[in-house]
């Protein structure tokens, strides 16, 4: 039997200083995880102690702090080199600033095979692109090898930025030829390395013939057996056992995101390739794990850039802005509640004395909020701290939408709610309530909207046929998070501005912020 | 000038195979994808796959999978398609299309092959 | 996968005249379509592409628009060379590129 240590990240989305818990902005050292310096301290004990060893990453290392907003993925390169990754499966993610904001910084600086087998080049880009990622490589590892598979979403092209000369293949379609190319290599054991969520690994652990071990990412999914370290809730065990369509156990994980945990899975081969056995949990990095002195220092140098940028303070909060999954996609959630309060801010424009605003409404989705920010600090919020709550450099736009549209919305919100889904929506100068008890698309049973032509607002109920100004994000007026309706049905779309620039502006005019939870979002007895 | 020249019309018996040329000029060939499509009747056209003549790279509609295979030769700029195992239900035009330099849809089509395939 | 519907299936009209065609995708397909053009015997030729940008030589009177899921070509003032069918087709981020079912323009 060959035993092979399997070190696995997926959705660092930019984390590379170590974060707090709920994987924020640091605050108090002490109780600070994750960030490259205290990941290599763990790789390289494991890699110190125990002989067959891979450090893969799953995608999504782009997008998601001030270090991408400045370094725009040469800090990815840099970093993964310092580490020493084995191979990298490309998410989603890596296409938001195009192409070429792939190629130029990470693709061709990357000393580790980038990896997606699903993703075809073609027209003037092929050449360009010709070998700067694989659908796979095999790796020499101790005296055997093994082949690493890449994939990624097929869902990319509407997720993020790759352009018209990059074709996403369904994975499963697009695997089963390139692992049947490994075998005829006589390489026989096979991992699939990919960024499509924990469902589709599923799949392609069912489904793809001569695939060994499934290491994905996308969907943020975290697998532990035993009693999980910190708050993250098991979506299952680690690992995750798939029986193939062809009789084989498949053993498939995920290591949550943010670099919080170092995925460790040990997998036991017999001599013809096939699982004897498989076991591991993630890696809690938390401090008890010490930073690498070399990474930290250099992490330090390069934060100079960032320091120049972001840190001037832009305002105070005397309270915790809550701006995590476990809130803003299932409630009301301050965070929300303040983006929404700045972004109708940024829209007052007097017209007359029949009307006191001309807009008075707010949607956002919660998926649209990646990060909370701690009051702890002094209370500081700078610009780096609102990057990592909005990464996606959108805008925030004013639409006019039916009644009946906007009702549509609000049962999309929440017809799959329970999921953890990015489209229950955060809401200003509207108050909802949800029956959930209801069937999906029944589930509104009070939606009230702020008068504007009013001298003092007040909320009346929603009216189907009239129109309704609506401040929104460009993701969702155009459709995205499946808000198709919106995209359809809107009657007017204006461009506004920049989505940190509305918030770090109202903040700075506020001085003093105390966002609070006041019943916007609100869900009737017996359904929550 | 863009020409794409194909090879010309076919009669074979069912079961028999057969290869279609698509002759490229006045553009560098390597540099844009090349597209098969499919018409039956004169009416609905489907598109069979494409090849990227610079890496080879395929990509298939799932319905013409071990139907159709397309290859290029670059020394003679020239494409090909394979279609195996004919049947009445093959009978169609079939095109060569070069794909837009910012993708997907095609700019150039060739004259057309017609093949009947008939016992 | 995502289907394009046209209508109507087809339509005569007189030299002078405007008509439109329309296109529906299954799923939203932004702005990511195409028109072609086919004369009886001939192979097609590209009129629009990313729904509203006129091929090389398309003369102005035709013109695309729509976004999402519903997209139309209008043709105005119909020239006898305008005769023939008109096919929809997306063309970006899955490796189909699905024609829709076409549509037959004849002269009244």
């Known amino acids: 039997a060959w035993e092979l240590t399997i070190l696995h990240t997926n959705d660092v989305h930019s984390r590379l200083e170590q974060t707090s818990e709920d994987s924020s902005k640091c605050v108090n050292a002490s109780r600070c995880m994750g960030g490259v310096a205290r990941l290599f301290t763990k790789v390289q004990q494991i890699r110190r102690a125990e002989p067959n060893v891979l450090l893969l990453d799953a995608g999504d290392q782009y997008q998601g702090t001030i270090w991408f907003t400045v370094y725009k993925g040469a800090e990815v390169a840099h970093f993964m080199n310092a580490l020493r990754y084995d191979a990298m499966a490309l998410g989603n993610h890596e296409f938001d600033n195009g192409v070429e904001g792939l190629i130029e910084p990470l693709l061709k600086e990357a000393k580790f095979p980038i990896l997606s087998a699903n993703i075809k080049a073609k027209g003037p880009l092929a050449s360009q692109i010709s070998g700067l990622y694989l659908p796979y490589k095999v790796l020499p590892v101790g005296d055997e090898v093994v082949g690493i598979v890449g994939y990624t979403s097929k869902e990319t092209p509407f997720l993020s930025n790759p352009g018209t000369n990059l074709v996403f293949e369904d994975e499963i379609t697009a695997l089963q030829p390139e692992v049947d190319k490994l075998k005829t290599l006589n390489v026989n054991k096979i991992i699939a390395l990919g960024h499509s969520g924990f469902e589709m690994d599923k799949l392609i652990a069912q489904k793809v013939r001569g695939v060994d071990v499934v290491v994905g990412g996308h969907s943020n999914t975290f697998l532990y057996t035993g009693n999980p370290p910190s708050k993250e809730v098991p979506a299952g065990k680690y690992p995750f056992i798939v029986t193939s369509d062809d009789g084989r156990k498949v053993p498939v994980v995920q290591a949550y995101a943010f670099g919080k945990y170092l995925g460790y899975l040990k997998i036991e081969f017999d001599e013809r390739g096939n699982v004897i056995s498989s076991h591991g949990n993630p890696i809690l990095l938390n401090s008890s794990i010490p930073e690498d002195p070399s990474i930290k220092a250099d992490i330090n140098k390069w934060r100079i850039k960032l320091d120049n940028y972001s840190t001037q303070e832009l305002g105070k909060t005397i309270v915790y802005l809550d701006g995590s999954s476990q809130s803003c996609r299932f409630r009301e959630c301050n965070m929300g509640n303040l983006i929404c309060d700045a972004m109708i801010n940024n829209n007052l424009r007097h017209t007359d004395e029949m009307f006191w605003n001309h807009v008075s409404m707010c949607i956002l989705n919660g998926g649209g909020i990646r990060s909370p920010i701690d009051e702890r600090n002094n209370g500081t919020i700078t610009w780096e701290n609102l990057a990592a709550v909005l990464p996606f450099g959108g805008t925030f736009d004013l639409v006019q939408l039916k009644g009946s549209t906007l009702k549509k919305a609000f049962e999309h919100s929440v017809h799959r709610y329970g999921q953890s889904t990015g489209e229950f929506l955060q809401v200003g100068g509207i108050h909802v309530v949800y029956d959930l008890s209801r069937k999906p698309g029944d589930r509104v049973v009070k939606l009230d909207v702020l008068c504007t032509k009013c001298r003092v607002p007040s909320y009346d109920p929603l009216k189907m046929d009239e129109v309704y100004k609506v401040i929104l994000p460009n993701f969702l007026a155009n459709g995205g998070d499946g808000f198709q309706m919106i995209k359809d049905e809107l009657l007017r779309h204006d461009s506004g501005d920049q989505d940190i620039n509305v918030v770090s502006t109202y903040i700075s005019k506020m001085k003093v912020i105390y966002p609070a939870v006041e019943g916007r979002i609100k869900f009737s007895t017996g359904s929550h | 000038e863009v020409q794409l020249q194909q090879s010309g019309p076919e009669l074979v018996k069912p079961g028999a195979s057969m290869k279609i040329s698509c002759k490229a000029s006045?553009?560098?060939?390597?540099?844009?994808?090349m597209n098969w499509v499919k018409q039956s009747h004169g009416k609905n056209l489907e598109w069979i796959g494409f090849?990227?003549?610079?890496?080879?790279?395929?990509i298939y509609n799932q319905k013409f999978k071990g139907k159709a295979t397309v290859t290029v030769d670059k020394s003679s700029s020239t494409a090909y398609m394979d279609l195996l195992s004919l049947t009445s239900e093959d009978s169609a035009v079939y095109y060569c299309?070069?794909?837009?330099?910012?993708?997907?849809?095609?700019?150039?089509w060739g004259q057309g092959t017609t093949l009947t395939v008939s016992s | 996968d995502i289907q394009m519907t046209q209508s109507p299936a087809s339509l005569s009209a007189s030299v002078g005249e405007t008509v439109t065609i329309t296109c529906r995708a299954s799923?939203?397909?932004?702005?990511?379509l195409a028109w072609y053009q086919q004369k009886q015997g001939k192979s097609p030729q590209l009129l629009v592409y990313n729904t509203q940008t006129l091929a090389e030589g398309v003369p102005s009177r035709f013109s695309g628009s729509g976004s999402g899921t519903q997209f139309s070509l209008k043709i105005n003032s119909l020239q006898p060379e305008d005769f023939g069918s008109y096919y929809c087709?997306?063309?970006?981020?899955?490796?189909?590129?699905?024609f829709g079912g076409g549509t037959k323009l004849e002269i009244k």
């Open positions: 799923e939203n397909i932004y702005s990511y």
């Open positions: 006045g553009y560098s060939f390597t540099g844009y994808t």
């Open positions: 299309a070069r794909e837009g330099y910012d993708g997907g849809y095609f700019d150039y």
């Open positions: 090849i990227t003549p610079y890496n080879g790279d395929t």
């Open positions: 087709q997306h063309h970006y981020g899955t490796p189909m590129y699905p």
